[in-house]
């Protein structure tokens, strides 16, 4: 499966999109920022296969995409903005699943690296747990949609692992 | 290697116009807002304004607003200060410097060298 | 705007000297400040974000702490290259702010 080239293409799709999302200036949300930690010295100090990298690209993306089909996340963005974002992301994750089965075959279950699943899933609890605590604000959202592109550029690993051969 | 890389000294007339340059290199210029300070000879740092280069979205000391336009070229990643007329006050060390946004990461990280603009009749 | 408010403006010491300068907040600015050194004909440099991250390649013997309106910086033990101006900066909101900023001199 072609999966870098196509990959790279819907990323920066969803990644323009996330940008065209915005709906007040970020300049107001300053005193909001938060530290989120995205696990990005464990990813870095990584060389990913690809089926880990696959593995652990497809939660990245999954939990963003749980993370925006929320009611919340609905009534804090421009609906057809949001659809064709939530889109871009149910394709990638098409991608990404159909890539699984080719690289290790129907009946086998890629080598789910745990360790980096656990910290991928306690990374997006801390945004939703932070989102709760801020009542999902606009500017809540607005800090959250600036992280999720920040983590979105940060795997850069990854991506690099999805170039190997197994 | 992240620069910023500012545009050469000017010695300017009052009355002139003037736009000084900030180019980024070595990251993600659209993930970075860009700031500006001054600071006048012996004096202290002033703030002035803010650019997201991303949709050129800008804010402004009350100090400096109306005095000064801050721009933004993505395509060739690149901050502008600029000055439609200028004043003999307006002397002084330009400096550029990235921030990281909504991000939580160190502010004003990298700063350009400055650019020095002195307007004298 | 946030008024920053620097102390003491000026202060000599000598080289191995444990010094101290203060910031303080016209109002609560949580953990957004900054700390920058700057050398004469240099650009500022970043010492200290978050009011008490130290910046990549800074030596260890900068630090800063507090939160709401009262900030310090800590130099531990002075050394030559240390003497340069300080200043201090919110970035709580905007417009953002500086302190006044504080010279270090040689005694």
């Known amino acids: 499966c072609d999966l870098p080239q196509t990959h790279s293409l819907r990323n920066r799709r969803a990644l323009i999109l996330l940008a065209q999302m915005g709906r007040i200036s970020p300049f107001s949300c300053l005193k909001d920022r938060h530290e989120f930690r995205f696990p990005e010295e464990e990813f870095d100090g990584h060389q990913f296969q690809k089926t880990q990298a696959i593995s652990v690209l497809h939660e990245m993306i999954q939990q963003t995409f749980n993370l925006f089909s929320t009611e919340d996340s609905s009534a804090a963005w421009e609906q057809s903005l949001l659809e064709k974002f939530s889109t871009e992301l149910y394709q990638q994750l098409n991608d990404l699943e159909a890539c699984v089965i080719q690289e290790v075959g129907v009946e086998e279950t890629p080598l789910m690296n745990e360790d980096f699943i656990l910290a991928v899933r306690k990374y997006f609890q801390r945004i939703t747990l932070y989102l709760m605590e801020k009542k999902y604000s606009p500017c809540a959202w607005e800090v959250v949609r600036a992280e999720i592109m920040r983590s979105f550029s940060f795997s850069t690993n990854l991506k690099k692992g999805l170039r190997r051969k197994d | 290697e992240v620069q910023l890389v500012q545009s050469g000294a000017e010695v300017k007339k009052p009355g002139e116009s003037l736009k000084i340059s900030c180019k980024g290199s070595?990251?993600?210029?659209?993930?970075?807002?860009i700031g500006w300070v001054r600071q006048m000879p012996g004096k202290g740092l002033e703030w002035m304004g803010i650019?997201?280069?991303?949709?050129?979205?800008?804010a402004y000391s009350p100090s400096f607003q109306g005095q000064v336009t801050i721009s933004a070229d993505k395509s060739i990643s690149t901050a502008y200060l600029q000055w439609s007329s200028l004043k003999a006050s307006d002397t002084a060390m330009y400096y550029c410097?990235?921030?990281?946004?909504?991000?939580?990461?160190?502010?004003?990280?990298?700063w350009g060298q400055g650019t020095l603009v002195t307007v004298s009749s | 705007d946030i008024q920053m408010t620097q102390s003491p403006s000026s202060l000599s010491a000598s080289v191995g000297d444990r010094v101290t300068i203060t910031c303080r907040a016209s109002?609560?600015?949580?953990?957004?400040l900054n700390w920058y050194q700057q050398k004469p004909g240099k650009a500022p440099k970043l010492l200290i974000y978050?009011?008490?991250s130290l910046q990549s390649g800074v030596p260890s013997r900068f630090s800063g702490s507090g939160s709401g309106t009262d900030f310090t910086l800590t130099i531990s033990s002075l050394q030559p290259e240390d003497f340069a101006t300080y200043y201090c900066?919110?970035?709580?909101?905007?417009?953002?702010?500086f302190g006044q900023g504080t010279k270090v001199e040689i005694k």
């Open positions: 410097a990235r921030h990281p946004g909504l991000n939580w990461a160190p502010d004003f990280d990298y």
């Open positions: 070595g990251y993600s210029f659209t993930s970075y807002w």
């Open positions: 650019i997201d280069p991303s949709d050129s979205d800008t």
């Open positions: 109002q609560s600015i949580s953990k957004f």
């Open positions: 978050f009011a008490s």
């Open positions: 900066q919110q970035s709580n909101t905007l417009p953002f702010t």
